[in-house]
Each structure stands twice: as C-alpha cells, then as structure tokens.
C-alpha cells in the first residue's frame, strides 16, 4: 500500500519514461536532406515527454536504450510515380554530437510509397537524431502517414 | 528486499501494463470496411491483458500513451495481383466515441502484399480502435501474417 | 526518497527489462535458411541484456510477453532485381524446443528490397528464435539495414 502511494507520488521522469511522437513540419532547403519535425498537443496527437526539439531535430535528454520508430509516406505517389523518379531513401541517425554520428536505420522506397520501421538502439543525453530523405518526391505531412518517435526502454 | 517483495505482490494492472495482440477473425459485411479481430490463448498466441474486444474491435481500458502496431498481409497476392486491383489501403483509427474519431495510422499496399507499421499515440479509456481495409483483395488470416496489437507505454 | 534509492539499487534484471538488438553475422550453409546473428558493444550498437546467443540464434532467458522486431534488407537489390528472382520470404519463429515450434512473423519481399515488422508474443525461458530467409538474394550486413531484436514488455 505504502509502495503504491509512493510510486504514484514519484514524478514520471524519475522512472525514465521519456517518450516522443512527432509529425512532419517541413522539408529542408535545397541542399539540406533533413526532415524538420514538430510536436505538441496543440498540433494534434504528437507530444514530447522528456526529449526536446532543436530546430526541428529530436534531442535526447536521458541515457538509455530507446525504441526508435518512423513512418514516411510520399505525397501524391503511386508505384508508377515512384519508379519514374530517382530512388528515395530515408535514413535515421545520430547527427550530433559529430563524434557520435552514425546511421541507425535506413530504408529505400523502391516502387513503394511508404516506409515504416523501428529498432532498439542506445542513445545518450545530448544525442540529436536526424532523418534524412534523399530523392525528388515530397513527403506527406498527413499526421497518420508520416511520423517519427522514440520510447525509452531501459537504462 | 522489502521493496522487491512489495513489487511482486502488486497486481500488474496497477502498473498499467495493458497489452493486447489480436489475430484476424473475419472481414466485415459488404459495406463495412472494418476488420474483425479475436484474441485469447485458446486461439494461439493472441491475448488481451487489460483491453477488451467489443464486437471484434479493440476497446481501451486505461488512459495513457500506447504503442499501436499492425501487420496485414493480403491473401493469394503477388505484386502483379496487387497492381491489378483497386488500391488497397489500411487505416487504424479511433472510431468511437465519435467525438474522438481520428485516423492514427494509414498505409497503402501499392505493389506490395504486406503492410506493417507502428506508432505511439495517446489513448483514453473507452476509445475503440478500428482497422479499415479498403480494396478488393482479401486479408490473410494466418496468425503470423496478419495481427494487430497495442502496448501501454506510460501515463 | 527511500523508494527512489531502493529502486536505483535493484538490479535491472529483477525488473524484467530483458532486451536485445542484433546485427547480421552471416547466412547459413546451403540447406540452412537461418540467418545467424551477433551482438555486443564491440560490434557497434548491438547488445544483449538478458537473452543470449546460441550458435547465432537468440535464446530467451525470462518468461514474458515480448515485442519482437526485425528489418532485413536485400543486398544489391532493386525492384527489378527483386521481381526477377525467386520470391524471397522471411519468417521469424520459435525453432526450439521443438514442442513449441511455431512461426511468429512472416513477410515476403515481393518487388521490394526491405521488410520490417514487429509483433507482441509470449515467449518462455529457453525458447530459441530463428529467422529463416528463403530466396536467392543475399541479405545486407549493414547494421542500419538488417537487424533483429526483442524487448521484454510484461510478465
């Protein structure tokens, strides 16, 4: 009984339940392949509990193993469209600090219009995750088609 | 030592570990695009711990942020089949209460025969999730090819 | 305050946070469709906390419900390549003990070069998971393209 009460009184942050789900804000300028994300209840069903956004990129606030997941759908796309354009690839990686730069997750669209995947990976406080989209087809901004999130799993 | 004992004595439900993994039961009648799900150990590896099924649709019993995941495979399908039929799309959303109706996750099959994705989303007690499959190809009922689940992640 | 201290002193294993993320080591010999995995910080971002590797296959050490996820990308692959080869299929299942042998997750590549999915499933201590890749295209060993992992979710 006392344990249950104590547990309820503890701030969630002390349990390490960092979590974020983001929606696409915009693509980068000409030479910048990064997707820029946004999150918060005012925007719909996106949120940040722990991690933060730094110029549209997701910054981790707690060390641990995270489940990283993403779905990106190309706008106005069919398998014909996809085959008639330069191959589109999405890569999720740590882009800063530079010393920890690495690609975590990479997918090509081939003749499809959606990619979706997830993986477990260790992340450290201060790691910034970038999602690079290369190709000439625009990603959909519909919140049920394109999203990116992380979930703290364990220390 | 005492904490570990106390922890073991607490019912899992008080920790909020609601989780469900469902298998396809059947598709809806003519004008109903919904997939109807079933779960329980007697059926194989599907289960419901917390959420419930209401006429084949999944109803949430605990407020929180959930990881929702789904895989649907079309039966008797090849890339040729898929491209020759009307585009098949899967959408997962809150279908009741009507005031909270929203699409959470949407994927098209294009020239593929399987879609799989996952996302984090806030759900509230009483939310019913529906999975709408539009198109003329039948989904596989094989339990390793078509499944739908939720996992409570945090309050 | 005392609870928080006690919590920090508890070994993570007592909380059941078993987790593993593996990278592809090699494919099997001629008649063996299994993929052989490896994990550990020396190899990059792969790890095993609880589960173990037994001859390249993942063995579970704690009963519970697990989230199993996988991504496999075919090497030197385009949609044309994929369509010109024998259909490639990936299946994740319990391969031992033989009494519990079952397919948990199955996907075909069709005209794509990557599959990615995830599901919740009950696993028991001693269950060994195998990932069978059938087809004539080689899987990529890039750690951001091909990976396999499990996460303990609840008892």
């Amino acid at each position: 009984q006392r344990f249950a009460q104590a547990q309820q009184q503890l701030p969630l942050e002390s349990l390490g339940w960092d979590v974020a789900e983001l929606q696409l804000n915009h693509t980068g300028p000409q030479q910048d392949p990064r997707l820029y994300w946004q999150g918060g209840p005012a925007l719909g069903r996106s949120f940040l509990h722990g991690p933060e956004l730094d110029k549209g990129q997701l910054r981790i606030h707690r060390d641990g193993i995270y489940m990283v997941h993403i779905q990106v759908t190309l706008a106005i796309c069919s398998s014909t469209t996809a085959s008639r354009h330069h191959p589109t690839t999405l890569a999720v990686g740590i882009c800063s600090p530079a010393s920890r730069s690495i690609s975590l997750l990479r997918l090509s669209f081939h003749q499809g219009c959606t990619i979706a995947s997830q993986r477990l990976t260790p992340l450290a406080r201060g790691d910034t995750l970038c999602t690079n989209l290369t190709g000439t087809l625009l990603p959909s901004r519909n919140t049920d088609e394109t999203f990116f999130g992380v979930q703290w799993v364990r220390p | 030592q005492r904490f570990a004992q106390a922890q073991q004595q607490l019912p899992l439900e008080s920790l909020g570990w609601d989780v469900a993994e469902l298998q396809l039961n059947h598709t809806g009648p003519q004008q109903d695009p919904r997939l109807y799900w079933q779960g329980g150990p007697a059926l194989g590896r599907s289960f419901l711990h917390g959420p419930e099924l209401d006429k084949g649709q999944l109803r949430i019993h605990r407020d929180g942020i959930y990881m929702v995941h789904i895989q649907v495979t079309l039966a008797i399908c090849s890339s040729t089949t898929a491209s020759r039929h009307h585009p098949t799309t899967l959408a997962v959303g809150i279908c009741s209460p009507a005031s909270r109706s929203i699409s959470l996750l949407r994927l098209s099959f294009h020239q593929g025969c399987t879609i799989a994705s996952q996302r984090l989303t806030p759900l509230a007690r009483g939310d019913t999730l529906c999975t709408n499959l539009t198109g003329t190809l039948l989904p596989s009922r094989n339990t390793d090819e078509t499944f739908f689940g939720v996992q409570w992640v945090r309050p | 305050q005392r609870f928080a201290q006690a919590q920090q002193q508890l070994p993570l294993e007592s909380l059941g946070w078993d987790v593993a993320e593996l990278q592809l080591n090699h494919t099997g010999p001629q008649q063996d469709p299994r993929l052989y995995w490896q994990g550990g910080p020396a190899l990059g971002r792969s790890f095993l906390h609880g589960p173990e590797l037994d001859k390249g296959q993942l063995r579970i050490h704690r009963d519970g419900i697990y989230m199993v996820h996988i991504q496999v990308t075919l090497a030197i692959c385009s949609s044309t390549t994929a369509s010109r080869h024998h259909p490639t299929t990936l299946a994740v299942g319990i391969c031992s003990p033989a009494s519990r042998s079952i397919s948990l997750l199955r996907l075909s590549f069709h005209q794509g070069c990557t599959i990615a999915s995830q599901r919740l499933t009950p696993l028991a201590r001693g269950d060994t998971l195998c990932t069978n890749l059938t087809g004539t295209l080689l899987p990529s060993r890039n750690t951001d393209e091909t990976f396999f992992g499990v996460q303990w979710v609840r008892p």
């Epitope: 693509t27 706008a75 008639r84 000439t136 087809l137 959909s140 519909n142 | - | -």
Partner: antibody, heavy 119, light 111 residues
Amino acid sequence: EVQLVQSGAEVKKPGASVKVSCKASGYTFTTYNIHWVRQAPGQGLEWMGDIYPGNGDASYNQKFRDRVTMTRDTSTSTVYMELSSLRSEDTAVYYCARFSRFDGWFAYWGQGTLVTVSS
Amino acid sequence: DIVMTQSPDSLAVSLGERATINCRASRSVSTSGYSYMHWYQQKPGQPPKLLIYLADNLESGVPDRFSGSGSGTDFTLTISSLQAEDVAVYYCQHSRELPYTFGGGTKVEIK
C-alpha cells in the same frame, strides 16, 4: 550552376517531325526529371510531359500521347523531345524545365526553342 | 484534367500599390498537407521564372514583396508594392496530378 541549353529554332512543314534537344549541366543528370512545356505565340503555357533520365521512363500529357516521344542520352546528359505529325497549331516555343529539389514546380528553364510549322 | 482559371486577365496598378491576382482550380489541389499551387512571372522573350511554390513558399532570390496564399481551390498571388520591374505576365500552375496545367495568365501593367 544548373543549366539547361536547348537546340536552335526549327522551321518544319505540316506532317513532318521535329526533335528538340535539351543539354543539362551543373548537376547529376540522372537524378532529376526533365519536363517539357510549350507556349504558342501570345498564348499560355502547356505541360507536355516529362522523362526520368535514370531509366528513360516518360509520362505524357494525353493530348500529345500519340505524337510525342521523350528520350535521353546519359552519355551527353541530353534529353530529347520529338513531336511528329506537325500541324500549324504546333507553332510554339518549346521549353525544357527542371524542378529544384522536389518534383512539381519548375525552378530551372531552358532558353526555349521556337518551332515554326508552315507550308 | 484540372482547369485553372486566372483573374483578372490584365491588371493596371500604380507604382508602390498592391496588386492581387487570383487563381481558381476546378477541383481541390490540396492534399497530403500541401497545396500544390505555384506561381511564375514571365517577361517578353524569356522563360517563366518561379516565384512561389506550394501556395505560400517564396522561391530563393525572389523579393519578399511577392507572397502567395490560399488552399483547396482558391489561391492568390500578391505583390505588396508594385515596382517597375514587376511588369510581366503571371501564371499559376498546379501539380496535384498529371497532367499539370497552367492558368491563362494575368498581364500586370503600370497605371
């Protein structure tokens, strides 16, 4: 610097064919689709179609489908637009154009090629 | 095909005054979180020049007196303070589906 340089003006008789070239430079040729847009004297702009130089796949405006062919030569980074069965109403300036990053709008244009169809 | 109707056909505005050009699509050109409407300026003897893309994004190097707005079927190009070098024909174009189509053009002159 991205540049699209088109071939010179042409005078053709009705029923003949014309082949206009568009040489690309300043970027990776096979990455970006090249579109063709024409403009009759004193008139507006009309999209004719586009080609993906990576594999040569083309998509045409239905209006021109039976008469237009778009091809490419990756060795010279050149795209060609051939229009057959010419008639007087095909007299126009023909432009090749390229988008900047995402397909759908045109940031780079060739200087235009005037094709005159006259008997 | 989506038909693009521009209005007015021509417009005479004093230097420093606001010029507004409208473009109406025969059906919505908004989807996937974007409005697929773009605006060009064309001067005699020159190819068109991109001004605005995706309804309201200013192309790099274009003066900020140009702006775009609208969604669905109705769109507007605004020149907040007309300059002498803005005398030209302006076209709208959609890329919602193939074939892409252009509006008939609006000729902007100085009053």
